[in-house]
Amino acid sequence: MMTGTIETTGNISAEKGGSIILQCHLSSTTAQVTQVNWEQQDQLLAICNADLGWHISPSFKDRVAPGPGLGLTLQSLTVNDTGEYFCIYHTYPDGTYTGRIFLEVLESSVAEHGARFQIP
């Protein structure tokens, strides 16, 4: 029986050219997390595997950074980044938990974004 719940950052907005943290938390289950996939619609952005660590899809390497934690940081945002993002937790023995985040990238500076991840 799947007892876990996923808490996400929900619907968020960010400024064009800025960065944003996508964050999901799985709680209320003793299942072991074996892998977390981050996906945008039908595209795989990144994988965080319990045994192999992080892997960023080659096509997103320049704009996607792992973390903080099991989250994902999107950088150099464009309006085309607007859309749905999914965190998919693969667990044993529960199975798969999925969280949804909707990101809106805005042209103006009214968006709220607070990524703390820095690339030197």
């Epitope: 808490e7 938390h25 799985l26 709680s27 003793t30 997390v33 965080c48 319990a50 192999l52 660590g53 992080w54 892997h55 950074a65 792992p66 973390g67 903080p68 934690g69 099991l70 940081t73 703390r116 991840f117 820095q118 690339i119 030197p120």
Partner: antibody
Framework: QVQLQQSGAELMKPGASVKISCKAT????????IEWVKQRPGHGLEWIGE????????NYNEKFKGKATFTADTSSNTAYMQLTSLTSEDSAVYYC?????????WGQGTSVTVSS | QIVLTQSPAIMSASPGEKVTISCSAS?????IHWYQQKAGSSPKPWIY???NLASGVPARLSGSGSGTSYFLTISSMEAEDAATYYC?????????FGGGTKLEIK
């Protein structure tokens, strides 16, 4: 097996800088965060910040910005933390730890003593 | 930042006694981790994500809680459980630790 081997104890003068190393073996260094944690007697554990060796991306606790600087060398699988302008408040044991969801492997700690 | 307050700071328990350590968060978190540290050694992961025991941790230990209140329980105290226990949150940056609970054996 996974191991994090830290450099030895340091005795430093106030105002000096120190660079602590953390050599990782037994896993793919570039794919995991390395965290740095400070422990002073009676003060528990304090998170300093983290570095992702694969990209050089860093994340600092605001309290330690300007005090600590992280670097990583993927050719030698070694992470470094430099502490500057040392004072007696910096006297502590410093740990590096691997992070993936939690701090699953820790170094043995490096003792830094600041004394004139 | 999220402040984690552990209680008690120090406690002693007799062999076979039930022990409960609490970790209170200043705002709600999804889960916490617990670490065990013995004198002269590095901390070790002890309980992951509130209730998942790390490899090699005896089944007499358990973790529970949600929101702002979390607990580590030892159903029957043994000498090897004497150590300092720290809770930690990975909910929001900066990651923070509790002040620690030193558990001694009578």
């Amino acid at each position: 097996q996974v191991q994090l081997q830290q450099s030895g104890a340091e005795l430093m003068k106030p105002g000096a800088s120190v660079k602590i190393s953390c050599k990782a073996t037994g896993y793919t260094f570039s794919r995991y965060w390395i965290e740095w944690v400070k422990q002073r007697p009676g003060h528990g554990l304090e998170w300093i910040g983290e570095i992702f060796p694969g990209s050089g991306g860093t994340n600092y606790n605001e309290k330690f910005k300007g005090k600590a600087t992280f670097t990583a060398d993927t050719s030698s699988n070694t992470a470094y933390m430099q502490l500057t302008s040392l004072t007696s408040e910096d006297s502590a044991v410093y740990y590096c730890a691997r992070h993936l969801g939690a701090l699953d492997y820790w170094g043995q700690g490096t003792s830094v003593t600041v004394s004139s | 930042q999220i402040v984690l307050t552990q209680s008690p700071a120090i406690m002693s328990a007799s062999p076979g006694e039930k022990v409960t350590i609490s970790c209170s968060a200043s705002s709600s978190v999804s889960y916490i981790h617990w670490y065990q540290q013995k004198a002269g050694s590095s901390p070790k992961p002890w309980i992951y994500r509130t209730s998942n025991l790390a490899s090699g941790v005896p089944a007499r230990l358990s973790g529970s809680g949600s929101g702002t209140s979390y607990f580590l329980t030892i159903s029957s105290m043994e000498a090897e459980d004497a150590a300092t226990y720290y809770c930690q949150q990975y909910h929001s940056n900066p990651w923070t630790f509790g002040g620690g609970t030193k558990l001694e054996i009578k």
